[in-house]
Amino acid sequence: QPPPPPPDATCHQVRSFFQRLQPGLKWVPETPVPGSDLQVCLPKGPTCCSRKMEEKYQLTARLNMEQLLQSASMELKFLIIQNAAVFQEAFEIVVRHAKNYTNAMFKNNYPSLTPQAFEFVGEFFTDVSLYILGSDINVDDMVNELFDSLFPVIYTQLMNPGLPDSALDINECLRGARRDLKVFGNFPKLIMTQVSKSLQVTRIFLQALNLGIEVINTTDHLKFSKDCGRMLTRMWYCSYCQGLMMVKPCGGYCNVVMQGCMAGVVEIDKYWREYILSLEELVNGMYRIYDMENVLLGLFSTIHDSIQYVQKNAGKLTTTIGKLCAHSQQRQYR
Amino acid sequence: SAYYPEDLFIDKKVLKVAHVEHEETLSSRRRELIQKLKSFISFYSALPGYICSHSPVAENDTLCWNGQELVERYSQKAARNGMKNQFNLHELKMKGPEPVVSQIIDKLKHINQLLRTMSMPKGRVLDKNLDEEGFESGDCGDDEDECIGGSGDGMIKVKNQLRFLAELAYDLDVDDAPGNSQQATPKDNEISTFHNLGNVH
């Protein structure tokens, strides 16, 4: 049974509702019309809707849907954005502390190596920061560069203080000797392993959080299809055409429509669940050498031990290096 | 306050870092995040239901709209889309996700693979090859105190290495302090949009 036409057989009530959506436009018929041109709200009898109104309803329906989606994801989005920012800031603070601790170790134990050591330490921790943020830097190279840079200064300041200030050519020979003779023992390898493991995990943790934001942003700004727009219009607005302003859609019908509109989005579900569970697994494993806070804040100690190792073997090393880098040293003395 | 580098007497193998009761560490913050994220594990599957519950639907009314006509809420017609031949709901589902959704699914697959690769079996502290080289530091036995270093004359214990307070208020070196970098944390009671979307059906 078609519902009765609006009171007094006018479309007055429909007009006042539509005015809220589209103020000032005269698209609402004065009295119910056949509505043969309608494509979505197909009438069973006279209707208070025109083709233009239908288009406006479709636009509004899709807009409503987008707003509902955005409000649905607001808390989740805020949670991830907030944490991504907090963790990035926290990791940078850890790096800054680690740098300060390492500089303090040099200042207190090896004042003759400063300020050069400060610069090498600064470079190392700069690269650490950049690596965490996703830069294409090799951790082993970073650690090698730190020890390559430190050794010429240790050699000329601690082991062989008689040498003049080191020039680049003897430095290069000393850098080569550092690796060939394993002057720091296994400490560089230990640091490489610990730093690379902890930084890799930290980096992927931040990457995962940033991807979480991207996922929410993507689904947040989805543009719904015309088909979906028609379904939503029929569910939310077609009742108006019959003057049924206060009627609400049936719950089961709404679910069917939403599942149709969101079929694509719901496909993310499986991978989203896996994402959260995989992230949990990663976080559970972030301790000891997989925890950058633990590793970086302890680096000063390992570097200190590595320099002590060099000092213990200084006699033997000085003789060997004296022969190895004799050519460079002669050039420097001239 | 945290000690400045001048206050770190490394030669005495002592590292003082302020300890605050009930402080929030980075690892506890990570775990807290995971717990909160897990309450959103059903976010996407629950979305259709969430949107229906947050848009006008007939809950207590006897009559409701099924897209074509007014029907009784519990009748068979209530769930049926009244407009047959308009377009097929099944077709809409068959179209598959939009390209942007497919792209994000690919990215999720990739990160999930990376996360799985990186996740370490519980209890493994150091790699075998490092253990063999004699760098295994042994278990400190106390979650609060982590061993750092691993050779030389005695280990350094760092008590709760960083106090990770919600607003990241560290006593940093003046020349190292970031300008206006304090980050407020969302308080649970400030969030009113919705809770536990995963539980909405």
Partner: antibody, heavy 116, light 102 residues
Amino acid sequence: QVTLKESGPTLVKPTQTLTLTCTFSGFSLSTSGVGVGWIRQPPGKALEWLALIYWNDDKRYSPSLKSRLTITKDTSKNQVVLTMTNMDPVDTATYYCAHSRIAARRVLDYWGQGTL
Amino acid sequence: QSVLTQPPSASVAPGKTARITCGGNNIGSKSVHWYQQKPGQSPVLVIYQDTKRPSGIPERFSGSNSGNTATLTISGAQPMDEADYYCQAWYSTIMVFGGGTK
């Protein structure tokens, strides 16, 4: 797009201090991984690096000129300033500032037009 | 005297392959960048991190680096490629340029 422009006096008397300003756009010196460097080139000669400042305010100087150079940044104004004390006729050169990608091993990927 | 050694000049017939070398002790362990500078102009980055080409740089420019020599190669050199070429590397905390090749 990234642009940099050097400005400063064209003529400086011996023993005086040279102050050069690099004004840039298209990037921010508060972005992680960004740096700005100064390089000079005496007429008909090779490029010589002077100084580099990082986003985190770390500074690096040429060892041979370190005692005479100071590099500073003003992030809000998008400017980097280089001062060089005790100028000498041998310091006559075109002075360039350049954008540096610190992560890409300190490459200088965008250069200013230079100031003589 | 620069720690990175470049030949002062190099010449090649149009369409042929030009190779410019940059020598340095164990330079293969460094990342080397190459710049092109035409008369009266600012330098332009043509190769970075040994082998990478910035966008807008023709494919004829390529780079390699191993042992004690880094090389910039211009395959099918053109008259417009006539310029000074500088190699650059980062030594710990110091930026070093080669002496340039015309």
